[in-house]
């Protein structure tokens, strides 16, 4: 389980830094792209490419920009109002249940099944039974049952749903 964000995980602001613009809080909050000063009197801008805030806030620190992992490509860079957007490289995908890593897509479907959905950065290939059209969510079957397979492809559970 992940630990909560601590102040070490956030990018502290050098309050005297001349490049950081200041403005006054509105109703005790600072706008996207800013955080509030410790005395609550100023809104201090986040540093482009280093940290960000996406909504009105009373944060003492902007949030540190995400760095894309190896195996990911950067779709859009971090700005003061939006975190970096990372996406799995071609041929890999990220499941919602295990968002911490990109996994290799299978290269083919089990025998008796046909591919109806391609590998995307968000999902493995989708296979259905030829006859029934029942979905198969990604079990890698025994080697002799595999139409095409790639070594090192991690197994994931199979759930047949009507």
């Amino acid at each position: 389980e992940s630990a909560l964000i601590t102040q070490q995980d956030l990018a502290p602001q050098q309050r005297a830094a001349p490049q950081q613009k200041r403005s006054s809080p509105s109703e005790g909050l600072c706008p996207p792209g800013h955080h509030i000063s410790e005395d609550g009197r100023d809104c201090i801008s986040c540093k482009y490419g280093q940290d960000y805030s996406t909504h009105w806030n009373d944060l003492l620190f902007c949030l540190r920009c995400t760095r894309c992992d190896s195996g990911e490509v950067e779709l859009s860079p971090c700005t003061t109002t939006r975190n970096t957007v990372c996406q799995c490289e071609e041929g890999t995908f990220r499941e919602e249940d295990s968002p911490e890593m990109c996994r290799k897509c299978r290269t083919g479907c089990p025998r008796g099944m046909v591919k109806v959905g391609d590998c995307t950065p968000w999902s493995d290939i989708e296979c259905v039974h030829k006859e029934s059209g029942t979905k198969h969510s990604g079990e890698v079957p025994a080697v002799e049952e595999t139409v095409t397979s790639s070594p090192g492809t991690p197994a994931s559970p199979c759930s047949l749903s009507g």
Epitope: S2, T6, D9, I36, N57
Partner: nanobody, 125 residues
Framework: EVQLLESGGGEVQPGGSLRLSCAAS????????MGWFRQAPGKEREFVSA????????YYAESVKGRFTISRDDAKSTLYLQMSSLRAEDTAVYYC??????????????????WGQGTLVTVKP
């Protein structure tokens, strides 16, 4: 598994106040990101507010800025939303949300792993 139970909704006049509570059970929420979304009749769910990190600050949608205040009591596994200066456009079902990964606040519905059943807030004269 985390179960969420919201309470505190009801009918209130414009300008009135309500305090919503969200009690979490199943496990401690101290290591979880939490927040509130709402869904007005015929509209999509929208972000309201999020607790960004423990003992830290919070995020608010522009539409509720200065009127709503989010807070949490990890010892009681409870999230709160104090709503004041309520308007007719605040009428909605309010949902408490929790995410297993707290590195970033929950500002989109996709980031939430668990949802409460919702509590209805109606603002009318």
């Amino acid at each position: 598994e985390v179960q969420l139970l919201e309470s505190g909704g009801g009918e209130v006049q414009p300008g009135g106040s309500l305090r919503l509570s969200c009690a979490a059970s199943g496990r401690s929420i101290s290591n979880y990101a939490m927040g509130w979304f709402r869904q007005a009749p015929g509209k999509e769910r929208e972000f309201v507010s999020a607790s960004v990190w423990n003992q830290g600050g919070n995020y608010y949608a522009e539409s509720v800025k200065g009127r709503f205040t989010i807070s949490r009591d990890d010892a009681k596994s409870t999230l709160y939303l104090q709503m004041s200066s309520l308007r007719a456009e605040d009428t909605a079902v309010y949902y408490c949300v929790v995410a297993r990964t707290p590195e970033t606040p929950i500002t989109s519905a996709r980031g939430a792993n668990y949802w409460g059943q919702g509590t209805l807030v109606t603002v009318k004269p």
